[in-house]
Amino acid sequence: QKLLQVEMEEGSDAVLPCLQDPPDGPPERLIWSRDSQGPFLELSPGSPGLGIHVGRLGILLLIFNVSNEMGGFYLCQPAPPSQQAWQPGWTVSVEGSGELFRWNASDLGGPGCGLGNESSSSQPYVWDRDHPKEWDMGPACASPRGDLNQSSSLDLTVAPGSTVWLSCGVPPASVATGPVSWAHIHPTKPNILLPSLNLTAESPAREMWVLGPVLMLPQVTAVDAGMYVCRRGNLTTEIHVTITVRPAIWHWLQRKSGWIVPVVALLYLIFCLGCLVSFLHLRRALILRRKRKRMTDPTRRFFKVTPPAGNGAQSQYGNVLSLPTPTSGTGRAQRWAASLGGAAAPYGHPLSDVQEAGAAGSRSLPRASPEEEEGEAYEEPDSEADSEFYENDSNPAQDQLSQDGSGYENPEEEPSGPEDDDSFSNAESYENEDEELAPPVTRTADFLSPHGSAWDPSREAVSLGSQSYEDMRGILYAAPQLRSSRPGPSYEEDADSYENMDNPDGPEPAWGAGGHGGTWSTR
């Protein structure tokens, strides 16, 4: 028996490991239970590199880092492995493997091709009721790409190294509660051992990841605290999970797109300080210049005469005052400015650069779209019209449920709203505001969310600069109003563009993910 103590903050991901199998024996069945209740999850783990995601789209099989050996026919059943209720799941054809898998022979060839081969370099296999069958190559067939759009929606073509998500059935009608069993059939290579699992009535209504012997609970809350027990053969692992509750302000920040609010606030603060320092520096230079100019102007030069003591004849002119040197005067202000603003930006409006950087960062998303990553999508590139639920979906509101460009998404008939649009990336946290479940995709959350609060940094900068200046001019001396070194229209344009970008009522930018996109890493 192994005892583990796991402490974590609310909102982080709980990783609960189970004891490993003895190296010699077969993979033992894992049974997870909680707080002296009955089992909530029973799992027969498969080969390494596989996982299961329990979430909004039901129970999904995850195949990481797809290789040629993983091509073939995937079958499933909403039953334990001992039963014989297997149904066709998906075919997976790996690009460059030289093999093509189709449920139906009619999905192999293009028009006029009959039931011939997909290309001279790929050996086609079709499903013959209960086993794969090598399909004879026909003489005249279209090119591989031309044929891919002929395949059924259950035939996938993926790039090597990508991650595949397979449901048992088509979402939203896919298996969601368990039991569910998976099987892989390859006609010429050893079949991969796939996991099977059962979710019992005690199973929590929350998202879960099962990655081999590890149970992962993303975004834990106080209700997830307690004792988790994993039994594997005659080995038992007890994991005591303690969750530190975060203050309400944290939840507010989470609702406001998580890290974006504090980061933008910090950037804004840095910008404001830069503006202030630049302003003080400029103002100091202007003061000195004006003083120097005034003192050296012959038309304005004068001498104050103090009558000498005891001298009746008083002269109007006497000692000349010395001119101030550049180092004299408000030395404390200069030192303060130097300590803060050695490399301060000139007074102006650098936020346009921030905006451009944010947009560019959001635009350069990893594997953002199947159009850019051809061949990595679940659906073949040209088969948009035939597909019900794949990446090339015509509904832009929906997430692409794909890792490394392979996946599927909810059918067009049931588009998900922004609140369903959870996304995943390679960051180390997962956000799911409505606590519903969604599988990961490789799209990063927006750096500047269009749904954020509509504060206007440009206006803030102006008022802050103006206020500081007003406060200080009373202390020093009256001087002409300080003007921005930038022309007005350019300044306004920048402020306006930033304001528009952050406007929650405005249209979403084309590169925006929308919603409250949390992130998670499968690494």
Epitope: P26, P27, S44, L75, C76, P81, S82, Q83, Q84, W86, R129, D130, H131, S181, W182, A183, H184, I185, H186, T188, K189, P190, N191, L193
Partner: antibody, heavy 122, light 107 residues
Framework: QVQLQQSGPEVVKPGASVRMSCKAS????????IHWMKQRPGQGLEWVGC????????NYNEKFKGKATLTADKSSSTAYLQLSSLTSEDSAVYFC???????????????WGQGTLVIVSA | DIVMTQSPATLSVTPGDRVSLSCRAS??????LHWYQQSSHESPRLLIK???QSISGIPSRFSGSGSGSDFTLTINSVEPEDVGVYYC?????????FGGGTNLEIK
Amino acid sequence: QVQLQQSGPEVVKPGASVRMSCKASGYIFTNHYIHWMKQRPGQGLEWVGCIYPGNVNSNYNEKFKGKATLTADKSSSTAYLQLSSLTSEDSAVYFCARGGYYGSSYSWFAYWGQGTLVIVSA
Amino acid sequence: DIVMTQSPATLSVTPGDRVSLSCRASQSISDFLHWYQQSSHESPRLLIKYASQSISGIPSRFSGSGSGSDFTLTINSVEPEDVGVYYCQNGHSFPYTFGGGTNLEIK
């Protein structure tokens, strides 16, 4: 070509145990079930159970639970049937046959071993 | 368990005859019905799968029909080498079950 080679005949005493083997060749052993059938002299065929060598998943006929144990050794591509607490009722020819893929409805047997005769006699 | 009943138990025929062997399942098994021939002291040989699908290497005189619970194996023109016991098998669900067999004899 697919071949299933079974071990030779066994004469055992009542109450003892016997283990017979079925060595597969000509296909990927871990991809297909191995089924076992019993045939008493002059009688019909009875399905004992099956094992999937890929994950050692097995299914038994309720009638043979506690009597038969199915195992498989991937390294030698050999399946085993062990019978315990033998009685005269266990005297029969035991056949192994290659079944379908794990995950398919494949339930027919195109390839059979030659059979192992087990005689339980005092 | 699904019980498979075959009739007749024994069938004596003349070479060239057309014969039909019957198999009935105690419940519907769709077309998950397979036919085997077992000659004396040999292993069974698969003749027909899924009620009517022919098997490569098996003579075309063997054919199958039926669905649900009633099935028939037909030998169009019996040959002397067709002697043996014919078994039907339920392949619908575990435990797989076999019929008692029909013994085909040549007169």
